[in-house]
């Protein structure tokens, strides 16, 4: 095993930074391992509804906090109406999926497209029809849907009426929405994600103000939002586990995102401690209650005593173990801009392999789905995205090394993203798609980039052949 726990750090992620060369079975400078992934490895690709659907007020869809935020906070962006128009060009998305040959497609449901004001009453028929058609088409193609219930597009009405995720009333409302989705789509969906990267929802939505709803500076609100997101996830997991799993036989998790960090001085225990704090304050914040002991990490409880809410003993018991696998996001959103508080004066790193090893050590070697991975290119780059290929090759090599050399139980990989689209605070200034879309065109053709061809080959060969 590459990264072995050393004395004093047993079962603790700090061991990652205390490398003993005697325990390293592979030269760290060896960038690529020419080998295949396990048989039946789950290859997929993903999108977020707000990023690609467009049609932000078409066919009865209600506004989301991001639609509002775009109009009030983001300069030079009229709306997501341009985008890739997946709502209109569903068939083109399906063709793109066919081209790559993925085993699964991860997409999110736009809550306000189903329920314009967020409250579960009669669903918006056109919205229901869109997702139902998409699911039927995926099943027909033997492409497994992985469905995210919340990828940041909260119905604006819930923000205005309740204050959004700051108000614990939203927990039950989210559970009602999830129940509806399980009822309507659960026969065709075996993998559910409750919330995509709650860290960014809380930190950038309520701390830096860089994400919707754009509130900033209130640390108590940041941690209250995080608390409510965790409780909402847990409630939905228990709901699914009790009422839907017995007959739908699916799995449910939450996608947690993180950066990776390296100590300034690898032999310095204080720098190592700071790296541990850094990971704990971002990934551990959500992973510890869900994948760990049901509570916030002890360091966070000490350091943030005045702003971090508490879980009662009953709640700790309720939070613990509310994920059927570890869904992990590792991409630019957790790196740029990185919370300087989380950086702790250390050096950020794109070492996905080590991040996976940290998860293994901290959370008892869970089954892991890479639920989002990839990088970005400048918006001027069209189909020749060589940087994206380099990054993909690097990341995939790290995942393969983690599986083959470190015995980490990664069972699937989600390339991000299927299409160029709206990239949150970066709007349309960067591109993350494996398919190029000219946002100014009428037909929004999906043109495969070099990275799409490359990923197609990786999937076909199930890894790297010599």
């Amino acid at each position: 095993i590459l990264l072995r726990a050393v004395t004093g750090f047993s079962g603790d992620g700090r061991a990652i930074w205390s490398k003993n060369p005697n325990f390293t079975p592979v030269n760290e400078s060896q960038l690529f391992l020419y080998d295949t992934f396990p048989k039946n490895f789950f290859w997929g690709i993903g999108t977020g509804a707000l990023q690609v659907e467009g049609s932000w007020k078409k066919d009865g869809k209600g506004p989301s906090i991001w639609d509002h935020f775009i109009h009030t906070h983001l300069k030079n962006v009229s709306s997501t109406n341009g985008s890739s128009d997946s709502y209109i060009f569903l068939e083109k998305d399906l063709s793109a999926l066919d081209f790559i040959g993925v085993s699964f497609y991860q997409f999110s449901i736009s809550w306000p497209r189903l329920f314009p004001d967020g409250i579960v009453t009669v669903a918006n028929a056109k919205g229901l029809q869109y997702y139902s058609t998409l699911l039927d088409a995926l099943v027909l193609r033997n492409i497994e849907p992985i469905v995210t219930l919340y990828h940041w597009d909260l119905p604006l009405a819930l923000q205005e009426k309740y204050g959004g995720w700051k108000n614990d009333t939203i927990i039950d409302i989210f559970n009602d929405y999830a129940t509806y989705c399980f009822q309507m789509f659960g026969d065709r969906v075996k993998y559910w994600i409750t919330i995509h990267n709650p860290y960014l929802v809380a930190w950038h939505g309520y701390g830096t103000g860089m994400h919707a709803p754009g509130e900033k500076g209130n640390l108590a609100a940041v941690y209250t939002v995080g608390h409510n997101l965790i409780k909402a996830h847990s409630k939905v997991w228990h709901n699914y586990n009790t009422h839907f799993r017995p007959h739908q036989k699916g799995w449910l998790s939450i996608t947690l995102g993180s950066h990776w960090i390296e100590p300034n001085r690898s032999e310095n225990t204080m720098d190592i401690f700071k790296c541990q704090q850094s990971m704990v304050s971002v990934l551990g914040w959500f992973a510890n209650p869900i994948h760990g002991d049901g509570d916030y990490p002890e360091g966070m409880r000490k350091k943030l005593f005045s702003v971090l809410p508490i879980f009662s003993e009953a709640e700790k018991h309720e939070m613990r173990g509310t994920a059927d696998f570890f869904a992990f996001s590792f991409g630019p959103n957790n790196f740029k801009p990185l919370n300087t508080m989380a950086k702790m004066g250390q050096n950020v790193s794109l070492n996905l392999r080590e991040a996976l090893n940290w998860i293994k050590l901290e959370y008892n070697n869970p089954r892991i789905l890479i639920a989002e991975n990839g990088w970005f290119t400048d918006s001027r780059v069209k189909t020749e995205d060589t940087t994206a290929i380099y990054m993909m090759k690097n990341f995939l090599s790290q995942v393969l090394q983690a599986i083959r050399l470190d015995e980490i139980r990664v069972f699937g990989y989600t390339a991000w993203s299927l299409l160029d689209g709206f990239e949150w605070q970066d709007a349309y200034t960067i591109r993350r798609g494996l398919f190029y879309v000219d946002f100014n065109s009428k037909q929004k053709e999906r043109k495969p980039k070099s990275s799409a061809h490359y990923y197609k080959q990786i999937i076909r060969e199930n890894g790297f052949s010599l």
Partner: antibody, heavy 123, light 110 residues
């Protein structure tokens, strides 16, 4: 060695505003591990927390005093201050400024105290 | 009325052992960390125990702290006359969003 020193009038008239300043020496009020606090002790009674302020300006106050209290910080002077409005005889006490500490590895509580200053509310 | 409950007084002879209890609830002691303070007559309080059971440098190991559930205990062994003081427990209360103290316990060394 960090030291805290309270300063301000020892006598305040009822209904007026009590104002105290704490000067920090041997350390900085800009550290992220500390909450700069005010605590008081009425004659013959126990300790009562008034509130604290973080270097960024964030504050927490005792709910029973919240409507009358303002704590501010001046990082350039390495000082923090207390204002308590509409005082009555019940506000007569020894007022301590203090450093409340909590880090990633340890919860310290109030680890450094000033010597205290007696404030009497009387006409 | 203090949020944390301490006995008003305890006493013991020199050389003996004494314990002072501090009782709270899940919103304070139960889910947070406890500190203990010693206030000698006419002086400012001094930190005696932090993080439930740790001693700052300079505090003799005759002083110890522990926590169980929603209660904390300060122990003093080998009592000395110089230990005569008021002792306070303190912690954060998550429901009140406030620092809370016990009412104080007067230790008399007989």
């Amino acid at each position: 060695q960090i030291q805290l020193l309270e300063s301000g009038p020892g006598l305040v008239k009822p209904s007026e505003t009590l104002s105290l300043t704490c000067t920090v020496s041997g350390g900085s009020v800009s550290s992220g591990d500390y909450y700069w606090s005010w605590i008081r002790q009425p004659p013959g009674k126990g300790l009562e927390w008034i509130g604290f302020i973080y270097y960024s300006g964030g504050t927490n106050y005792n709910p029973s005093l919240k409507s009358r209290v303002t704590i501010s910080i001046d990082t350039s002077k390495n000082q923090f201050s207390l204002k308590l409005n509409s005082v009555t005889a019940a506000d007569t006490a020894v007022y301590y400024c203090a450093r409340y500490s909590s880090t990633w590895d340890y919860y310290y509580g109030v680890d450094v105290w000033g010597q205290g200053t007696t404030v009497t509310v009387s006409s | 009325q203090s949020v944390l409950t301490q006995p008003p007084s305890v006493s013991a002879a020199p050389g003996q052992k004494v314990t002072i209890s501090c009782s709270g609830s899940s919103s304070n002691i139960g889910n947070n960390y406890v500190a203990w303070y010693q206030q000698l007559p006419g002086t400012a309080p001094k930190l005696l125990i932090y993080d439930n059971d740790k001693r700052p440098s300079g505090i003799p190991d005759r002083f110890s702290g522990s926590k169980s559930g929603t209660s904390a205990t300060l122990g003093i062994t080998g009592l000395q006359t110089g230990d005569e003081a008021d002792y306070y427990c303190g912690t954060w209360d998550s429901s009140l969003s406030a620092v809370v103290f016990g009412g104080g316990t007067k230790l008399t060394v007989l």
